[in-house]
Interface confidence: low
């Protein structure tokens, strides 16, 4: 015997209170597949979120972040403040990268300059807060470990997971 609910299309739900007839999803809710017994509540985009795609009866709303913030996490589950290149975000706000580190993006953390000597190379262009050093070929008589800026800390990857 076929389940009568299987005939209910996306955008409706199988209403047990009305002899399992297909009722449209109420306002601010949706069902993205057929045969659903309830509709899901639409996501709201509040605070530093803004609406990227409105909710419809068949698909959820999608949020992104207001200017000055960027998404973190699957489906933009939270927003993190942008900083300038050469800065990283702390709880007190955006702070300049310490000497020996750089950040070439508006997000993430300051990372140590490349240690050219580890590859037997010399520093061709010095690093800045915004840019990594540029390594060049080893100069004559160069021995690894003699011509480089030592990074102050190991590199770390910025977090991009749900809060």
């Amino acid at each position: 015997l076929q389940d009568p609910c299987s005939n209910c299309p996306a955008g409706t739900f199988c209403d047990n209170n009305r002899n399992q007839i297909c009722s449209p999803c109420p306002p601010n809710s949706f069902s993205s597949a057929g045969g659903q017994r309830t509709c899901d509540i639409c996501r709201q985009c509040k605070g530093v979120f803004r609406t990227r795609k409105e909710c419809s009866s068949t698909s959820n709303a999608e949020c992104d972040c207001t200017p000055g913030f960027h998404c973190l996490g699957a489906g933009c589950s939270m927003c993190e403040q942008d900083c300038k290149q050469g800065q990283e975000l702390t709880k007190k706000g955006c702070k300049d990268c310490c000497f020996g580190t750089f950040n070439d993006q508006k997000r993430g953390i300051c990372r140590p300059w490349t240690n050219c000597s580890l590859d037997g190379k010399s520093v061709l262009v010095n690093g800045t807060k915004e840019r990594d050093v540029v390594c060049g070929p080893a100069s004559a008589g160069f021995s690894p470990g003699t011509s480089s800026v030592t990074p102050p800390a190991p590199a770390r990857e910025p977090g991009h997971s749900p809060q």
Epitope: Q44, L72, M78, H160
Partner: antibody, heavy 118, light 107 residues
């Protein structure tokens, strides 16, 4: 199912240190920001700190900044809170929590009591 | 950070409706969650995203949020609802803010 189990609480003298641990299970630990929230005896909830899934980003309440350090070991599914220069006002039950963020439910541990007293 | 203000206590007769307020500057533009906490237990989420109920939370719990006030409403209050209730505000960014808590007494 999701489980968070705190440990490491106890009695410590003012100025002392303590490290709390929170063992997580039942979900992909490294996918989630994790929080510490505390509650002084007879008082309300106070957010303390949060750490990103990879451990690279950390944030603190002003009341603990410079004294507490949040960290995690994703290979052990464990969250930590290193507490230094402890004060009497840090006496509280400390909860490890995965707090709601749009799509995921809230999960809290049962808490571990930290008492700072001479 | 926003400061959230709750009444220290609210009393209600069994079967009646309890309303607990949470005030904060333009709180309606932020997400509000509500927690129930019974003595010696961890907090339990009862409302999230202003008005959504997690699975397992009775239908008598509902929430609203607009302007400068969010409200937790418990219709047909039962003795087992006696607990402390905390609001929490979140604007989508990193840190969280909790209200001071309200002790609900069922007379």
């Amino acid at each position: 199912q999701v489980q968070l189990v705190e440990s490491g609480g106890g009695l410590v003298q003012p100025g002392g240190s303590l490290r709390l641990s929170c063992a997580a299970s039942g979900f992909t630990f490294s996918d989630y920001y994790m929080h510490w929230v505390r509650q002084a005896p007879g008082k309300g909830l106070e957010w303390v700190s949060v750490i990103s899934g990879s451990g690279s980003n950390t944030y603190y309440a002003d009341s603990v900044k410079g004294r507490f350090t949040i960290s995690r070991d994703n290979s052990k599914n464990t969250l930590y809170l290193q507490m230094n220069s402890l004060r009497a006002e840090d006496t509280a039950v400390y909860y490890c929590a995965r707090l709601y963020a749009q799509f995921e439910g809230d999960f809290w541990g049962q808490g571990t009591l930290v008492t700072v007293s001479s | 950070d926003i400061e959230l203000t709750q009444p220290p206590s609210v009393s209600v007769a069994p079967g009646q409706t309890a309303r607990i307020s949470c005030s904060g500057d333009n709180i309606g533009s932020k997400y509000v969650s509500w927690y129930q906490q019974k003595p010696g237990q961890a907090p339990v989420l009862v409302i999230y995203s202003d008005s959504e109920r997690p699975s397992g939370i009775p239908e008598r719990f509902s929430g609203s949020n607009s302007g400068n006030t969010a409200t937790l409403t418990i219709s047909g209050t039962q003795a087992e609802d006696e607990a402390d209730y905390y609001c929490q505000s979140w604007d989508g960014s990193i840190s969280r803010v909790f209200g001071g808590g309200t002790k609900l007494t069922v007379l």
